[in-house]
């Protein structure tokens, strides 16, 4: 229903704490370079204004849309053009064009230093002195680095962060308590960031219909006992919520998400038997718990999918009368029977089924034509199954770091034009799929692997779109979202690439590498590996192994030397010479 004052309505629904957190996230995602202090000042102004509107909905400006109010605030920032250049041009536009303009200027790879976690004592001191400010900084730092992070979920992670600090800051060994717990929150949040970016990409590039199809498949897998009408309702709501968050309507998004959680908990009987534990939790945890809920048990008496979608003589009539609904029903029926498939695979099968009906229903004898459609699914199912098998075997053989290196070599050969930092980031993330998915039971591996890879490849596409350098990457990224992963998997060595000339400085290292944390050391080595492949794209696995082994020994030796600098200076050139020879 319409409210006189949108901002008053959201403030009342969300409560002051969540309202302020969401406004801070919104501003941090739009203006990613502004310091925390500047944003928090704006947040306070907006909050004070919202309170005046709660007191009197007819007060001046209370009837304005939230986009108008937020946009006016952002555009009033002094020196906006100095700091943001052409983003300031957005301020000359009217809503809704102004908001669209802000969205287009979101930077997926902002030039910000990696978020450094302070050491335990310092963290606990600042948390205990001012928890609100500490958590505000967390929201700000994550939101500005991830401008599409799902806002209500980020509030949830801030709450988790708060819990960990509250618990660990009273311990004697704070670091031992904090490190693993915060690492776990960080890992989950980073995965959440790439997954949500994929959802926003889907929405931006292919519209609501594509996103809704994704939602139908996902919900059907999770809630196989729910009727199609119920799944459709849930998918429609989830699509609306995600559209709002991807579009910067964070208050409405969070409010609608809470509403959906309430609806699901009030209608457990028609949705799933697994919801009760989630429904006892407070709002943020409830929504998060529902989003991560385990699959309900598949009904025992499901008939063969062929009955309604191949054998029924009215297939073409039914399809012609309501194509999207008929295909939606197919997707629902297939997905609820296959929690062991990835959503990407299920959508590829639905697409194949649609193409088959489009072709066959226009022919003379449709049943004869579409009669074999389910058998034709087999190669589509086998391809990702083989991908999972070969990659998990490789991961088990090499471990995470070795597997990342294998992926890095593979992807540098596929797209050597892509910048080394982007390739290293992508390979490290793709390589984590092993740890994340290969240890799971067989039935969970495929959905875990393929849907995670799809999200990581979407990140690669988003970064590549900013500065396109590889025709092959552009081709895979331009196609349908569900075909991306197979497209990348099918890429081979780029024969058109002219190898990079060998630059000694690329492979020159200094003693500072010795004091780096393990992760940074790995990145240095992986950067060198990518550069080697760019120099010799057709180097054999053995050649690369030799050079990298030699390199690891060199670093190890010099870091143990009494005079480290001297060791790096004298041994370095020898290493470079040996490497050139090994790759000749």
């Amino acid at each position: 229903e319409a409210h006189k004052s949108e901002i008053a309505h959201r403030f009342k629904d969300l409560g002051e704490q969540h309202f302020k957190g969401l406004v801070l996230i919104a501003f941090s995602q739009y203006l990613q370079k502004c310091p925390y202090e500047e944003h928090i000042k704006l947040v306070q102004e907006v909050t004070d204004f919202a309170k005046t509107c709660v007191a009197d909905e007819n007060a001046e400006n209370c009837d304005k849309s939230i986009h108008t109010l937020f946009g006016d605030k952002l555009c009033a920032i002094p020196k906006l053009r100095d700091n943001y250049g052409e983003l300031a041009d957005c301020c000359a536009k009217q809503e809704p064009e102004r908001n669209e303009c802000f969205l287009q200027h979101k930077d997926d790879n902002p030039n910000l230093p990696p978020f450094q976690r302070p050491e335990a004592e310092a963290m606990c001191t600042s948390f205990q002195e001012n928890p609100t400010s500490f958590l505000g900084h967390y929201l700000h730092e994550v939101a500005r680095r991830h401008p599409y992070f799902y806002a209500p979920e980020l509030l949830y992670y801030a709450e988790k962060y708060n819990e960990v600090l509250t618990q660990c800051c009273t311990e004697s060994d704070k670091a031992a308590c904090l490190t693993p717990k915060l690492d776990a929150v960080k890992e989950k949040a980073l995965v959440a960031a790439v997954r949500q970016r994929m959802k926003c990409s889907s929405m931006q590039r292919f519209g609501e219909r594509a996103f809704k199809a994704w939602a139908v498949a996902r919900m059907s897998q999770r809630f196989p006992n729910a009727e199609f009408a119920e799944i459709t309702k849930l998918a429609t709501d989830v699509t609306k919520i995600n559209k709002e968050c991807c579009h910067g309507d964070l208050l409405e998004c969070a409010d609608d998400r809470a509403e959906l959680a309430k609806y699901m908990c009030e209608n457990q009987a028609t949705i799933s038997s697994k919801l009760q534990a989630c429904c006892d939790k407070p709002v943020l945890q409830k929504s998060q718990c529902l989003a991560e809920i385990e699959h309900d048990n598949i009904p025992a008496d499901l008939p063969s999918i062929a009955a309604d979608f191949v054998e029924d003589k009215e297939v073409c009539k039914n399809y012609a009368e309501a194509k999207d609904v008929f295909l939606g029903t197919f997707l629902y029926e297939y997905s609820r029977r296959h929690p062991d498939y990835s959503v990407s695979l299920l959508l590829r099968l639905a697409k194949k089924y649609e193409a088959t009906l489009e072709k066959c229903c226009a022919e003379g004898d449709p049943p004869a034509c579409y009669g074999t459609v389910l058998a034709e699914f087999q190669p589509l199912v086998e391809e990702p199954k083989n991908l999972v098998k070969t990659n998990c075997e490789l991961y088990e053989k090499l471990g995470e770091y070795g597997f990342q290196n294998a992926v890095l070599v593979r992807y540098t050969q596929k797209a050597p034009q892509v910048s080394t930092p982007t390739l290293v980031e992508a390979a490290r993330n793709l390589g984590r799929v092993g740890t994340k998915c290969c240890t799971l039971p067989e039935a969970q591996r495929l959905p875990c692997v393929e849907d995670y890879l799809s999200a990581i490849l979407n990140r690669l596409c988003v970064l590549h779109e900013k500065t396109p350098v590889s025709e092959k990457v552009t081709k895979c990224c331009s196609g349908s979202l569900v075909e991306r992963r197979p497209c990348f998997s099918a890429l081979t060595v780029d024969e058109t690439y002219v190898p990079k000339e060998f630059k000694a400085e690329t492979f020159t290292f200094h003693s500072d590498i010795c004091t780096l944390p393990d992760k940074e050391k790995q990145i240095k080595k992986q950067t060198a590996l990518a550069e080697l492949v760019k120099h010799k794209p057709k180097a054999t696995e053995d050649q690369l192994k030799t050079v990298m082994g030699d390199f690891a020994q060199f670093v190890d030796k010099c870091c143990k030397a009494a005079d480290k600098d001297n060791c790096f200076a004298t041994e370095g050139p020898n290493l470079v010479a040996r490497s050139k020879e090994a790759l000749a």
Epitope: A229, K317, E321, A322, K323
Partner: nanobody, 123 residues
Framework: QVQLQESGGGLVQPGGSLRLSCAAS????????MVWVRQATGKGLEWVST????????RYADSVNGRFTISRDNAENTLYLLMNSLKPEDTAVYYC????????????????RGQGTQVTVSS
């Protein structure tokens, strides 16, 4: 809101022809499948013919196949049914219909329908 207005019915002798039209508004006609159904006095709704959004897929009930032709003009938001070699058993009220969200496909009582146009085949 969805509006469907049939026209073109009338009294015709057996073996004669009629062309029914259906003017559609209030929904995305060019992306919607369309249906003709009919109802003889004292009987239930009977499906006659279906045409897909892009006219590529066309289906007829066995009782009218070879005699009736369904077509559409997406530019004019109009559905047609050309009826040749009419028989007394074709006498009925003819409705054009389209799928209503939330209904079951093929459950024509739940589809959006117009007021209907009467076709009477008699000598």
């Amino acid at each position: 809101q969805v509006q469907l207005q049939e026209s073109g019915g009338g009294l015709v002798q057996p073996g004669g022809s009629l062309r029914l039209s259906c003017a559609a508004s209030g929904f995305a006609f060019s992306t919607s499948g369309m249906v003709w159904v009919r109802q003889a006095t004292g009987k239930g709704l009977e499906w006659v013919s279906t045409i897909s959004d892009d006219s590529r897929i066309i289906r007829y009930a066995d009782s009218v196949n070879g005699r009736f032709t369904i077509s559409r003009d997406n530019a004019e938001n109009t559905l047609y049914l050309l009826m040749n070699s009419l028989k007394p058993e074709d006498t009925a009220v003819y409705y054009c219909a389209t799928y209503r969200a939330g209904s079951r496909i093929g459950s024509y009582e739940d589809y959006y329908r117009g007021q209907g146009t009467q076709v009477t085949v008699s000598s």
